[in-house]
């Protein structure tokens, strides 16, 4: 569910939302750390209805959710880390 990507692409998110999405409707969360062409951390959420939204990293609900997911993944498998090439 929780993925961290290191990418040399520019920022992916044009606008961010802080609207709450319950975890039952979330398929995947992608975290893009700041740097490498983008000055801010970005969080991209894939929903179970196939839509995608950028979430404000400061939104309290996403911080709480990521903490829960980190705890869960650390007790099973490590959070996957991927390196992306420029297409």
């Amino acid at each position: 569910v929780l993925e961290v990507y290191y990418t040399s692409l520019r920022c992916r998110c044009v606008q961010e939302s802080s609207v709450f999405i319950p975890r039952r409707f979330i398929d995947r969360i992608q975290i893009l750390p700041r740097g490498n062409g983008c000055p801010r951390k970005e969080i991209i959420v894939w929903k179970k209805n196939k839509s995608i939204v950028c979430v404000d990293p400061q939104a309290e609900w996403i911080q709480r959710m990521m903490e829960v997911l980190r705890k869960r993944s650390s007790s099973t498998l490590p959070v996957p880390v991927f390196k992306r090439k420029i297409p």
């Epitope: 709450f20 999405i21 319950p22 975890r23 409707f25």
Partner: antibody, heavy 123, light 106 residues
Framework: EVQLVESGGGLVQPGGSLRLSCAAS????????MSWVRQAPGKGLEWVAT????????YYPDNVKGRFTISRDNAKNSLYLQMNSLRAEDTAVYYC????????????????WGQGTLVTVSS | DIQMTQSPSSLSASVGDRVTITCKAS??????IAWYQQKPGKAPKLLIY???TLQPGVPSRFSGSGSGTDFTFTISSLQPEDIATYYC????????FGGGTKLEIK
Amino acid sequence: EVQLVESGGGLVQPGGSLRLSCAASGFTFSSYAMSWVRQAPGKGLEWVATISDGGSDAYYPDNVKGRFTISRDNAKNSLYLQMNSLRAEDTAVYYCARDYYGSGYEDSPMDYWGQGTLVTVSS
Amino acid sequence: DIQMTQSPSSLSASVGDRVTITCKASQDINKYIAWYQQKPGKAPKLLIYYTSTLQPGVPSRFSGSGSGTDFTFTISSLQPEDIATYYCLQYDNLYTFGGGTKLEIK
């Protein structure tokens, strides 16, 4: 007091369509996601659809996806379920239920339910 | 899809008895389980959510416990008005209800 009143149920032939409505009162409708849950005669509960507070997101289980459409009109405090290509196995009491509070971050499930409306699919 | 296996499907108990219903999830659902009571001809009523949080107005004789895949719903002292069918619901990944437990008085 939270009140949810369903309407629009009835007898419909297989392959037919029906539109259910749910009138909400006693809470700020536009702040809550809403869901439909059904119960076949003598059977258990089955989730049918959920729509976000603003109406931009909808979710369905695979068995109704592409046939059912959930929608809402926040100005009228109303929730809808458009059911197309109905099958005998869609026969059930359909309940509307208040779901999570969209303006918060408490991940709570459906808390208030209407009394239901019966949909019978038969030839 | 997550399956919820609820047991028993029916049970008979006496007033004052301690009653326990279990739900087993087919995969880890953290603590995202709720319990509902449904009386004949009525809508379901939420009793407990997030495993053990009692809905306001629900008597303290109702309680819930568990985490991961195994969950328990308990009525500490059965009352005549508790006769109903009880359902668990997982809301970790979409929604899945258990098959229900019909509770009767001996």
